[in-house]
């Protein structure tokens, strides 16, 4: 979660929560008493924005959280890594029936970055997002937090980009980072033929058939 | 419910050690961090530091480095706090309080039990 | 280590009044900051979470509000029992510092 953000090669990011400066300003639903903007501190004292929403209380929560408008440059399949805290309802007294300990994770395609509103029914399901019994333990500045990582991929997709949401049922959740990205295959070279960079298939199975040149003093 | 049940009143000697504690029922004691604040008379409260509950380890704000140890009897869902070499200065109210050990966002992130506090008096 | 200084030291009310206390962070606490309430002789109790959140059971005529590194408890139209002593604190980085108090008498 912290330091320097170093990812693979084969990984190109669109979106990096942690690396955004200034708040993220993402949109919320309702705009007041569901998902919220709040700030922690990372060891390196520098604020980590997150995402946080705990109406284990009151029951219907249905709280929605839409990110900016991501590009997909080309992609077909983009990957989502979200890595957040989710309360265990056992911990929290008087909440049985109302607290929930899932969210769901939805994406809408579309060639308008500016869209300005939720609008819910235009937004596909990828996956109900849950705790995995397996955490990181992290210390982030002056605190502990059981970090749980999931990664969902969504495709083939056809527009210029796409919105996430998150929508929350009445769960006690943080949501420390939220990561998108593509793969591609890295610059290759097969017996003096060089193959560019290219972005991997709508499926993680697919073939991508790509035209390679000859390397510097070569020939076909 | 939930409370966090302090020692009694001690009147010590300067140079003399104190050991005060803190016991907590109505929760899970190893699901809340354990926290110690300073308030001398007449003065404002002074956070002293705090202690994990799960691994025992301290922490320690500058001022109450050296003389001052935090520990704990998890069996008995209990912290103490130990004085060691007192002084004039530690003549003051102490009081444990509990946050989460881990944190699951600001709704849960604040002192919400504490200690009604125990008075050490060091007089000669 | 951050600072938090709060103001005023004291006051000095008549009840229904409104009063407002603030407190100074010596650098941006991104809204991390709880107040409480201490009656003499007694331990602090919660009155605001998270800068502007109401703890359970805390009258509404509290509230809490700011950001960055200013930040102000207003209490409207005050009680006999609203009288005593109120401190900010920070949770931004340890060591968690409290304001140095202000002490709300009756006129």
């Known amino acids: 979660v912290t330091g320097s953000r170093v990812y693979p090669a084969n990984e190109v990011t669109l979106l990096d929560s942690r690396s955004v400066q200034g708040e993220l300003g993402w949109i919320a639903s309702p705009l007041e008493g569901g998902w919220e903007e709040v700030s922690i501190m990372d060891e390196k004292n520098t604020p980590i924005r997150t995402y946080q929403v705990c109406n284990v209380m009151e029951p219907s929560q249905n709280n929605w959280l839409r990110t900016d408008w991501i590009t997909r440059e080309g992609a077909q399949r983009v990957y989502i890594e979200i890595k957040f805290t989710l309360r265990d309802c056992n911990s929290l007294p008087g909440v049985m029936g109302t607290c929930k300990e899932t969210f769901n994770l939805y994406y809408y395609e579309s060639d308008n970055d500016k869209e300005r509103f939720i609008r819910e029914n235009q937004f596909v399901k990828i996956d109900t997002i849950a705790a995995d019994e397996s955490f990181t333990q992290v210390d982030i500045g002056d605190r502990i937090m059981k970090l749980n990582t999931e990664i969902r991929d969504v495709g083939p997709l056809s527009k210029k980009g796409f919105y996430l949401a998150f929508q929350d049922v009445g769960a006690c959740i943080a949501l420390v980072s939220v990561r998108v990205f593509y793969k591609k295959c890295p610059l290759t070279v097969r017996n003096l033929a060089q193959f560019p960079d290219t972005i991997t298939g709508a499926d993680t199975s697919s073939l991508v058939e790509v035209r390679g040149s000859c390397v510097n003093n070569s020939e076909e | 419910q939930i409370q966090l049940v302090q020692s009694g009143p001690e009147l010590k000697k300067p140079g003399e050690t104190v050991k005060i504690s803190c016991k907590a029922s109505g929760y899970t004691f190893t699901d809340y961090s354990m926290h110690w604040v300073k308030q001398a008379p007449g003065k404002g409260l002074k956070w002293m530091g705090w202690i994990n509950t799960e691994t025992g380890e301290p922490t320690y704000a500058d001022d109450f480095k050296g003389r001052f140890a935090f520990s704990l009897e998890t069996s008995a869902s209990t912290a103490y706090l130990q004085i060691n070499n007192l002084k004039n200065e530690d003549t003051a109210t102490y009081f444990c309080?509990?946050?989460?050990?881990?944190?699951?966002?600001?709704?849960?992130?604040?002192?919400?039990?504490w200690g009604a506090g125990t008075t050490v008096t060091v007089s000669s | 280590d951050i600072q938090m200084t709060q103001s005023p030291a004291s006051l000095s009310v008549s009840v229904g009044e409104t009063v407002t206390i603030t407190c100074r962070a010596s650098?941006?606490?991104?809204?991390?900051l709880a107040w409480y309430q201490q009656k003499q002789g007694k331990s602090p109790q919660l009155l605001v979470y998270a800068a502007t959140n109401l703890a359970d059971g805390v009258p509404s005529r509290f509230s809490g509000s700011g950001s960055g590194t200013q930040y102000s408890l207003k209490i409207n139209s005050l009680q006999s029992e609203d009288f005593g002593s109120y401190y900010c604190q920070h949770f931004w980085g340890t060591p968690w510092t409290f304001g140095g108090g202000t002490k709300l008498e009756i006129k």
């Open positions: 650098e941006n606490i991104y809204r991390n």
């Open positions: 309080a509990r946050i989460p050990l881990y944190y699951y966002g600001s709704r849960y992130w604040y002192f919400d039990v």
